[in-house]
């Protein structure tokens, strides 16, 4: 169970002190992925690190991906795991550390010179070969948006929302991800009743735009749970 996974790591990350002046908040820490994890202001080995439960890659850090901690383990028990370094095996882009992506089941460097064409080809092939994701689609990837020279326009292939131009987000379309418009007031949105349920969407909608939230449309309150319509409404 998830509890047993979590309880096997007793030391909890401590919050950083808030007493310091705003101009002296401390220094950045970095760690070699897969070796050390930062905890508060000190390093902790993975043995002492409290794994974070997750439903999708986006809930993990940029140097992590979301998966079951045991091979062939309970699919319902997922935690954030350290990303895979270059030349390590992978099943989707998110498993590879920043600056790398998953090609033919191996994490390879995202060389800027041939990155764009190759990654689009890889996105396509990732969904139709033996190295496709466990559930049939790719989620967040840690590829840096700096590798794209220009922000993607509507319909452009993307890996994460920061690859898309302002007013667009990166959302699934069939088994790829493309830049789609962020939802405006009154537009139908998807409210996920349970964590990770958006994994089932083939045509994923963007989130609601700034100042809006996805709520039940007022005249649909009486409808049955399954047919309730959600729209983007002002806070």
């Amino acid at each position: 169970t998830l509890n047993s996974v979590l309880n096997s790591n007793a030391i909890k990350n401590l919050p950083p002190p808030l007493g310091g002046a705003a101009g002296h908040p401390g220094s950045a820490v970095s760690a070699a992925p897969g070796i050390l994890y930062p905890g508060g202001n000190k390093y902790q080995t993975i043995d002492n690190y409290q794994p974070y439960p997750c439903a999708e890659d986006e809930e993990c850090g940029t140097d992590e991906y979301c998966a079951s901690p045991t091979r062939g383990g309970d699919a319902g028990v997922q935690i954030c795991l350290a990303c895979r370094k270059r030349r390590k095996r992978c099943m989707r882009h998110a498993m590879c550390c920043p600056g790398n992506y998953c090609k033919n089941g191996i994490c390879v460097s995202s060389d800027q010179n041939h990155f764009r064409g190759e990654i689009e080809e890889t996105i396509t092939e990732s969904f139709g070969n033996d190295h496709s994701t466990l559930d049939g689609y790719s989620r967040r990837t840690t590829l840096s948006s700096k590798m794209y020279h220009t922000k993607g326009q509507e319909g452009s292939v993307c890996l994460r929302s920061s690859d898309c131009a302002s007013g667009l987000c990166c959302a699934r379309h069939f088994w790829s991800k493309i830049c789609k418009p962020v939802l405006k007031e009154g537009q139908v949105c998807t409210k996920h009743r349970r964590k990770g349920s958006h994994g089932l969407e083939i045509f994923q909608r963007c989130y609601c735009g700034e100042g809006l939230s996805c709520r039940i449309q007022k005249d649909h309150h009486q409808a049955s749970n399954s047919s309730r319509l959600h729209t983007c409404q002002r806070h």
């Epitope: 990350n13 401590l14 919050p15 950083p16 908040p25 401390g26 220094s27 950045a28 820490v29 970095s30 760690a31 994890y37 930062p38 905890g39 508060g40 202001n41 690190y49 409290q50 974070y52 997750c54 999708e56 986006e58 809930e59 993990c60 850090g61 940029t62 140097d63 992590e64 954030c80 350290a82 920043p98 967040r140 840096s144 948006s145 700096k146 994460r160 929302s161 920061s162 989130y207």
Partner: nanobody, 125 residues
């Protein structure tokens, strides 16, 4: 290196609303956690709300749950704090802060490395 600039706060009546923004310069924003802190006169700075690098996870202190909403737009390098149903006890200097989001943990437990200069929010009764 990330530099954060908060929008102007202001004076608002109890029950009113205010929207703060926090704009970052530097390419690290889209892979950083963002938090909003506040410090009332004579009190310690407290963590109000946070959002992870992707926007998939948010956290709210009990005192602001249901009234405040945090969001972010990585394409604009900006985070937002929408404050509704404001109370006099929300009066404080509000700080936007950011830190690397390399490894997931509770949003209140990150090391917030970069800080804005703070903006005054006053709620009158």
């Amino acid at each position: 290196e990330v530099q954060l600039v908060e929008s102007e706060g202001g004076l608002v009546q109890a029950g009113g609303s205010l929207n703060l923004s926090c704009t970052a310069s530097g390419s690290a924003f889209s892979s950083s956690v963002v938090g909003w802190f506040r410090q009332a006169p004579g009190k310690e700075r407290e963590f109000v709300t946070g959002i992870n690098w992707s926007g998939a996870r948010t956290y709210y202190a009990d005192s602001v749950k249901g009234r405040f909403t945090i969001s972010r737009d990585n394409a604009k390098n900006t985070a937002y704090l929408q404050m509704n149903s404001l109370k006099p006890e929300d009066t404080a200097v509000y700080y936007c802060a950011s830190g690397r989001d390399r490894y997931a943990r509770e949003l209140s437990e990150y090391e917030y490395v970069w800080w804005g200069q703070g903006t005054q929010v006053t709620v009158s009764s």
